[in-house]
Interface confidence: low
């Protein structure tokens, strides 16, 4: 439906508060280095302009596209060339090339200082002094560090952030009330950002078909009672929403997401019995709740899949006449029967089925050729099952920290060229799969574990893409979206790697380690572990364990010493010498 003024349309649909918040997110995700004040100024100018268009849709420039309006505004930033270098060249282009250019310059790992949490009293004072600025600052800081964060969901996080401060800043013990809430928001926010990053990578690197296949599988698991036609409609709408958000069209995305939530709630009866509670909530909570809703119960007495997809004489006819619809139906029928499978496994099965039909429908006797296609699924199903079983046993034996260390060693040996901070971050996140998924019963382990690993490995892929250093990472990341995890699992030690030169400075520690949080201290030790493996890739588990145990004892001893700095200097030299001897460095 065409509107005279797109900006007026979105302003009226979303309301001023959400409009301003979404424009701020959009600008911060594009110009990640710009100061907060500059962004606020730009947002205010756009908002004032939008209001003139609401008053008179025929006013000058009101008929321009949002990309044109926003791009023109971003290109007025005076320091664009100095701050962003070649990104300034985007401004010489016309739409839609200019927006594509801005998108290509989004940085997944911007060079920004770590967000340090001030004292609780300082935060509460800032919140009370100027609530609006305080919340805008939150949106800005998250958006610029996570340039693909799902914008309508960030509005939901901001709402929870505000609620936490409103409640806790008047509590007797502000810190006890606030800090756990902020920790929870931080952890959930990182997870949400990573999940959305995978959706955007799926759309941008593998195309709409790949995203739609993922959505068919996931929605069919979640809404197994819904008809295929209903699932297809939801997939089409969901694809539009995520395409818009990943493309920087945040106003359209938020508006369409609200429409989708409305549709789902109006049609609950034909979608899922689990939506009732979600649909009673306000908009932002409703959309979040629907996105996280548990799987509905499977319909009773679903007929065997073989009848329609193997035994029927019409398989090749059906496939030839409507390939994607037929494969979509296969995926829908398989996924609704298998909430116990990961989405990526379901997509591997669908791909195997597709490959088999491509081959067999051209054969002399197609039915004879594809009759045993379901037998080909067995090894594909067993591979992740066995992997999860082994790794959950290892996790239960070691606990999270040591399990992370085992993965650090494993992945550093596979891809030693990758930067140490990236290996630490990715391996720590891979290791969290244990606490997240191994507690689940068998039926929920695989969807939890393998789909989570897809999200984490995508982090590795997007970070590596910025500065590619390993052909093996590039190969696993680009060949097949659904086979990324099996590709990385199959990598052995990189025999071509030339060990890193030993540098004593890398293993020199100071008293500041003693004041770090437990998490930060773990990261320091894990950084040292990665460096050790890069120096000695053939070191055994036992050798590495011995060195790490010595290292832990050294830190503990020196943190208890009266003269900590001297202890770190002297004992550190001894530790380095002992480690070199133990590893033959």
């Amino acid at each position: 439906d065409a509107h005279k003024s797109e900006v007026a349309h979105r302003f009226k649909d979303l309301g001023e508060e959400n409009f301003k918040a979404l424009v701020l997110i959009a600008f911060a995700q594009y110009l990640q280095q710009c100061p907060f004040e500059d962004h606020v100024k730009l947002v205010n100018e756009v908002t004032e302009f939008a209001k003139t268009c609401v008053a008179d849709e025929s006013a000058e420039n009101c008929d321009k596209s949002l990309h044109t309006l926003f791009g023109d505004k971003l290109c007025t930033v005076a320091t664009l060339r100095e701050t962003y270098g070649e990104m300034a060249d985007c401004c010489a282009k016309q739409e839609p090339e200019r927006n594509e250019c801005f998108l290509q310059h989004k940085d997944d790992n911007p060079n920004l200082p770590r967000l340090v949490r001030p004292e609780v009293d300082v935060m509460c004072t800032a919140f009370h002094d100027n609530e609006e600025t305080f919340l805008k600052k939150y949106l800005y800081e998250i958006a610029r560090r996570h340039p693909y964060f799902y914008a309508p969901e960030l509005l939901f996080f901001a709402k929870r952030y505000k609620a936490a401060f409103t409640e806790c800043c008047q509590a007797a013990d502000k810190a006890a009330c606030l800090l756990p809430k902020l920790d929870e928001l931080r952890d959930e926010g990182k997870a949400s950002s990573a999940k959305q990053r995978l959706k955007c990578a799926s759309l941008q690197k593998f195309g709409e078909r790949a995203f739609k296949a993922w959505a068919v599988a996931r929605l069919s698991q979640r809404f197994p009672k819904a008809e295929f036609a209903e699932v297809s409609k939801l997939v089409t709408d969901l694809t539009k929403v995520h395409t818009e958000c990943c493309h920087g069209d945040l106003l359209e995305c938020a508006d369409d997401r609200a429409d989708l939530a409305k549709y789902i709630c109006e049609n609950q009866d034909s979608i899922s019995s689990k939506l009732k509670e979600c649909c009673e909530k306000p908009l932002l909570e409703k959309s979040h709740c629907i996105a996280e809703v548990e799987n509905d119960e499977m319909p009773a007495d679903l007929p065997s899949l073989a009848a329609d997809f193997v035994e029927s004489k019409d398989v090749c006819k059906n496939y030839a006449e409507a390939k994607d619809v037929f494969l979509g139906m296969f995926l829908y029928e398989y996924a609704r029967r298998h909430p116990d499978y990961s989405v990526v496994l379901l997509l591997r099965l669908a791909k195997t089925y597709e490959t088999t039909l491509e081959k067999c429908c051209a054969a002399a006797d197609p039915h004879e050729c594809y009759a045993k296609v379901f037998d080909e699924f067995k090894p594909l199903v067993e591979e992740p099952q066995n992997l999860i079983k082994q790794n959950c046993e290892l996790f239960e034996q070691l606990g999270e920290y040591k399990f992370q260390n085992a993965l650090l060693v494993r992945y550093t040996k596979k891809v030693p060229q990758v930067s140490t901070p990236t290996l630490v971050e990715v391996s720590r996140n891979l290791g969290k799969v244990g606490s997240k998924c191994c507690k689940h019963p068998e039926a929920k382990r695989m969807p939890c574990a393998e789909d989570y690993l897809s999200v984490v490995l995508n982090q590795l892929c997007v970070l590596h893409e910025k500065t590619p250093v390993s052909d093996r990472v590039t190969k696993c990341c680009t060949e097949s979206l659904v086979n990324r995890r099996p590709c990385f699992s199959a990598l052995e030690v990189d025999e071509t790697y030339v060990p890193k030169e030993f540098n004593a400075e890398t293993f020199t520690f100071h008293a500041d380690i003693c004041t770090l949080s437990e998490k930060e201290r773990q990261i320091k030790k894990q950084t040292a572990l990665v460096e050790l493996v890069k120096h000695k890739p053939k070191a055994t588990k036992e050798q590495l364990k011995a060195v790490m145990d010595d290292f832990a004892a050294f830190v503990e001893k020196c943190c208890k010493a009266d003269d900590k700095e001297t202890c770190f200097a002297e004992e550190g030299k001894k530790l380095v010498a002992a480690s070199q001897a133990a590893l033959g460095l």
Epitope: A226, F228, A229, D314, A322
Partner: nanobody
Framework: QVQLVESGGGLVQPGGSLRLSCAAS????????MSWVRQAPGKGPEWVSA????????RYAETVKGRFTISRDNAKKTLYLQMNSLKPEDTAVYYC????????GSQGTQVTVSS
């Protein structure tokens, strides 16, 4: 976008007849087997009848065998259900589905058999 729209329902006396239609769009209708499913008030969905893509092979639930006839017109992308000798227990919302699914996606058409 896949869409199925049923019509032809209504109020009929026991022993009467109705013909239901289902107009399909957004997919290659002639490539897929289709079904009719019904859901009586307070009950779960019940599969009624199915037809293969070409229209040659038809199947019926025991409760409707001999009374109901399923057919299709692939050129018009329409599925039909001719219902004769209707009984009060046939009262339900009837809806069409792709394949042999018993899950409800479309809005359906209400059939009420009552004197």
């Amino acid at each position: 976008q896949v869409q199925l729209v049923e019509s032809g329902g209504g109020l009929v006396q026991p022993g009467g007849s109705l013909r239901l239609s289902c107009a399909a769009s957004g997919f290659s209708f002639g490539s897929f087997g289709m079904s009719w499913v019904r859901q009586a008030p307070g009950k779960g969905p019940e599969w009624v009848s199915a037809i293969d893509s070409g229209g040659a092979d038809t199947r019926y639930a025991e409760t409707v065998k001999g009374r109901f006839t399923i057919s299709r017109d692939n050129a018009k992308k329409t599925l039909y259900l001719q219902m004769n000798s209707l009984k009060p227990e046939d009262t339900a919302v009837y809806y069409c589905t792709i394949g042999r699914s018993t899950s409800r996606g479309s809005q359906g058409t209400q059939v009420t058999v009552s004197s």
